[in-house]
């Protein structure tokens, strides 16, 4: 049974019975605010294998492990997230272990496990086997590992049953509880899931399967589920739904929107059954199930009740998806996040008009404001104190506002304010004054030339490429040796490159300050010989593919007032040479007479150039005597060749712990006082925790229904 559109279990633990027949929860699962400690041992939901959105646990007294409740939960898809997270375990007072021993995949989003005073077995789980990226996981304020003494099955008897992996340079056993190992698939399966017996599942399976290489035996599907089969795409006349299954037109037409009773019903668009037309499209008539393109952007007015909309996470940005006119003020405060630039563009990229002010502060994750890629008008009908309608304060990594060569933005009323943006060059701000029509409105105090751009290469010399050579999968480029005023200040060069089918990329595409970057980066040391031009060989490239490349000099040079002087090249577009195409696909031959063969094939998946012709070769084969030597009717099977398995025993190295002593026999050192940077980081960390907690409370505490 598919349950949904989201299950909220609160106050009374007996509500858990609602999960009894669920195999998939299409939506989220909240279990929260159960203040009376209960005995959960009689509650067990072995049928539940998939949650399509997220799982949130908050203040559930008496619950000690999730393993008994959800023994077969295998996949949390994270189709929609709770403040960037797909799994949140917060203030669970009695939880001793997570215990979700069958959890194999969190498809999107991170995890947040915080303030669970009794929670152990956190350091024994290798989350990198479950999530794509673990850098945004937030595991804080739980039981200290030293007090836990987590032991994986069999380690006491010196017969360890679990496998080992390395986390933070620590090679150790991985398990969920004292008697449940963390399942790992053989390396031969690659990214594929596997059965309990370590046989590889079908590529379309996700998490696990009951039989190998069988797309009908998957516990969950990598892409879509239809009629008992996992499929890479929905078959004709069916439509993607909720990110995981295929449904027909009738099903889509009969869905009632959970959001509002007066909704116009779901629509079918671009092969998907969805609640409303996506951005750029509008219903083809009020009762229509189909979407047509808008002429220009579709008008969608979004209004914020509280006048000011705070964007502090992907979740809060999600609310603005499709909005073209925002009635109110935007306060952008993005301190961290995964792939934040592209996620924000996804949800805010269509906003054209903001009627109030735009304030960007403490957004250390932002490198550019280009995610607001269609913003063309700030009306400034409401302004901040001091008559500001565009206010940019303390954004430690902001380097670019917009690409002013391709951008028209008007600020109708109000002034601009910029302070403490150390990587934002003042010339970029003055360019914005010109473009937006605010020149002359700002006072001297509104744009501080000292604390904006003081850590940026605002004075940039141009590096010129001197030669480019290409082969099918390599590019060799050289450039003029840059000579800053003091030659010793040139440290090295960084080469940035990426595939660029079109000549429209910018330096800041897909870039945020948390590590996401669509550019590949290579460091190039200075040639020891001062007469040799620096250069690089980029290898492992795709044949017949256009790449964008640019180079930056890494320098120490400062000009007066601590402004760094740097150098970078223009973006160069260069195509690799053509190569031999991959083999033609799906070759079929059939004889239609005693003297003819008909051969059919599909084009190669990698043409590696412009295909001009195919060569078909054939030759007569002598009949193989081997075919006659074996009796195919006998029960003896043809022997199968065995291959050596290349496993290596890894010997564990244990070092003696070192005790640091200060000044001879003075005994152990005391902790160093915290640096200003550490104190600041702690302060920001505390603030981030508060913001999340506020978001949690605002999301889950709702008025009782009348």
């Amino acid at each position: 049974e598919i349950c949904g559109p989201g299950i909220d279990i609160r106050n009374d633990y007996q509500q858990l019975k609602r999960l009894e027949n669920c195999t998939v929860i299409e939506g989220y699962l909240h279990i929260l605010l159960i203040s009376k400690a209960e005995d959960y041992r009689s509650y067990r939901f072995p049928k539940l294998t998939v949650i399509t959105e997220y799982l949130l646990l908050f203040r559930v007294a008496g619950l000690e492990s999730l393993g008994d409740l959800f023994p077969n939960l295998t996949v949390i898809r994270g189709w929609k997230l709770f403040y960037n997270y797909a799994l949140v375990i917060f203030e669970m007072t009695n939880l001793k272990d997570i215990g979700l021993y069958n959890l194999r995949n969190i498809t999107r989003g991170a995890i947040r496990i915080e303030k669970n005073a009794d929670l152990c077995y956190l350091s024994t789980v290798d989350w990198s086997l479950i999530l794509d990226a673990v850098s945004n996981n937030y595991i804080v304020g739980n039981k200290p590992p030293k007090e836990c003494g987590d032991l994986c099955p069999g380690t006491m008897e010196e017969k360890p049953m679990c496998e080992k992996t390395t986390i933070n340079n620590e090679y150790n056993y991985r398990c969920w509880t004292t008697n449940r190992c963390q399942k790992m698939c053989p390396s031969t399966c690659g990214k594929r899931a596997c059965t309990e017996n370590n046989e590889c599942c079908h590529p379309e399976c996700l998490g696990s399967c009951s039989a190998p290489d069988n797309d009908t035996a998957c516990v969950a599907c990598r892409h879509y589920y239809y009629a008992g089969v996992c499929v890479p795409a929905c078959p004709p006349n069916t439509y993607r739904f909720e990110g995981w299954r295929c449904v027909d037109r009738d099903f889509c037409a009969n869905i009632l929107s959970a959001e509002s009773s007066d909704s116009e019903g779901f629509v079918i668009h671009d092969g998907e059954c969805m609640q409303e037309c996506p951005s750029g499209f509008i219903r083809n008539g009020s009762q229509s199930m189909y979407c047509i393109p808008c002429e220009g952007p579709c008008p969608k007015v979004c209004e914020e009740e509280k006048k000011t909309k705070t964007i502090d996470s992907v979740t809060s940005a999600q609310m603005l998806q499709g909005c073209t006119i925002f009635k109110g003020n935007l306060l952008i405060n993005i301190r961290r996040g995964n792939n934040i630039a592209s996620e924000l563009e996804n949800f805010m990229g269509l906003i054209e008009v903001v009627t109030g002010y735009v304030k960007i502060r403490h957004s250390h994750a932002l490198v550019s404001l280009s995610f607001l890629k269609n913003l063309r008008l700030i009306l400034g009908e409401e302004q901040l104190e001091g008559n500001y309608s565009f206010y940019v304060l303390d954004n430690q990594n902001l380097q670019q506002l917009w690409d002013w060569d391709h951008r028209n933005l008007t600020i109708k009323a109000g002034k601009m304010y910029f302070a403490f943006n150390p990587k934002l060059c003042v010339s970029e701000i003055y360019r914005m004054e010109e473009v937006t029509g605010t020149k002359g409105r700002q006072s001297k105090g509104d744009i501080n030339t000292r604390n904006n751009g003081e850590r940026a290469s605002c004075e940039s010399d141009v590096l010129h490429f001197t030669s480019t050579t290409t082969s099918k999968n390599r590019i060799i480029i050289t450039w003029h040796r840059y000579r800053p005023p003091d030659y010793r200040d040139l440290i090295s060069f960084t080469v940035y490159y990426k595939e660029a089918p079109f000549k429209n990329v910018t330096e800041y595409d897909g870039q945020d300050a948390c590590g996401s970057n669509s550019w590949n980066m290579v460091d190039v040391d200075l040639p020891p010989n001062k007469d040799v031009e620096p250069g690089i060989l980029l290898h492992g490239l795709k044949p017949w593919t256009q790449y964008a490349v640019y180079v930056k000099a890494v320098t120490l040079t400062m000009v007066e007032n601590d402004h760094i002087r740097g150098a970078k090249s223009e973006i160069l577009y260069i195509r690799t040479n053509a190569s031999v195409p991959s083999i033609p696909l799906d070759v079929l031959s059939a004889s239609n007479s005693s003297s003819q063969l008909i051969v059919k094939w599909n084009p190669p998946s990698l043409p590696n150039g412009n295909l001009s012709y195919y060569i078909v070769r054939w030759q007569r084969q002598p009949q193989d005597g081997y075919l006659y030597r074996h009796n195919y009717c006998s029960k003896d099977k043809i022997p199968i060749r065995k291959y050596a398995d290349g496993t290596i025993d890894i010997e564990e190295v244990t070092e003696n712990p070192k005790t640091e002593v200060c000044g001879g026999e003075k005994g152990p050192c005391c902790a160093c006082p915290k640096t200003e940077a550490e104190k600041q980081a702690e302060k920001e960390e505390a603030e981030y925790r508060k913001v999340f907690e506020n978001f949690l409370h605002n999301s889950i505490f709702v008025p009782r229904p009348e």
Epitope: S427, Y430, K444, E560
Partner: antibody, heavy 119, light 112 residues
Framework: QVQLQQWGPGLVKPSGTLSLTCAVS?????????WSWVRQPPGKGLEWIGE???????NYNPSLKSRVTISVDKSKNQFSLKLSSVTAADTAVYYC????????????WGQGTLVTVSS | DVVMTQSPLSLPVTPGEPASISCRSS???????????LDWYLQKPGQSPRLLIY???NRASGVPDRFSGSGSGTDFTLKISRVEAEDVGVYYC?????????FGGGTKVEIK
């Protein structure tokens, strides 16, 4: 120590163009400062003409805007003033000055150049 | 434009005595960042102006501590606690908040 050295012709004919240059030494013109021109007619007070940032961004006094051009030459570490269609009312001592970090105060001044407009 | 009005026009002083010059602006020079964008300059005969006080009350480097600036918003004062003979010249106030930057008409300080 930053120094501003200015030069230019002391006599300009009416309807001609006044041209002055100010060289910055002991510091870079590409620092986070604005560079201004101020003038003082004989026996009168000070009048701000305009300013430039090293990126080329400028602000001018509206009363002179149609006749003024201020430019910067980063390679020579200097900036220049051009005032067109001059009349006798433009006779003054012209000063170049540095607006420290664009915060609206002049901490360094040139020595001044007296420009007389006369035929 | 912001109009700056200075008084008195002329100030005869006795060495060792205090002196005070007033400056009023047509609109507030107090920015939301808390600074008053008002500066004081001294121009001695035949010389370029020299910065004395910036952003309301900050003494420029090398300026003796007998000079002090005070005031906020639209009313400002330059005080010389004990005038010395070398302090003669024309004192100008200037608003540095809005372009065009504008100067007061000047106050001529001379020894009695």
């Amino acid at each position: 120590q930053v120094q501003l050295q200015q030069w230019g012709p002391g006599l300009v004919k009416p309807s001609g163009t006044l041209s002055l240059t100010c060289a910055v030494s002991g510091g870079s013109i590409s620092s986070s400062n604005w560079w201004s021109w101020v003038r003082q007619p004989p026996g009168k007070g000070l009048e701000w003409i305009g300013e430039i940032y090293h990126s080329g961004s400028t602000n001018y006094n509206p009363s002179l805007k149609s006749r003024v051009t201020i430019s910067v030459d980063k390679s020579k570490n200097q900036f220049s003033l051009k005032l067109s269609s001059v009349t006798a009312a433009d006779t003054a001592v012209y000063y170049c000055a540095r607006d420290s970090s664009g915060q609206g105060y002049f901490d360094y001044w040139g020595q001044g150049t007296l420009v007389t407009v006369s035929s | 434009d912001v109009v700056m009005t200075q008084s008195p026009l002329s100030l005869p002083v006795t060495p060792g005595e205090p002196a005070s010059i007033s400056c009023r602006s047509s609109q507030s020079l107090l920015h939301t960042n808390g600074y008053n964008y008002l500066d004081w300059y001294l121009q001695k005969p035949g010389q370029s102006p020299r910065l004395l006080i910036y952003l309301g009350f900050n003494r420029a480097s090398g300026v003796p501590d007998r000079f002090s600036g005070s005031g906020s918003g639209t009313d400002f004062t330059l005080k010389i606690s004990r005038v010395e003979a070398e302090d003669v010249g024309v004192y100008y106030c200037m608003q540095g908040l809005q372009t065009p930057l504008t100067f007061g008409g000047g106050t001529k300080v001379e020894i009695k």
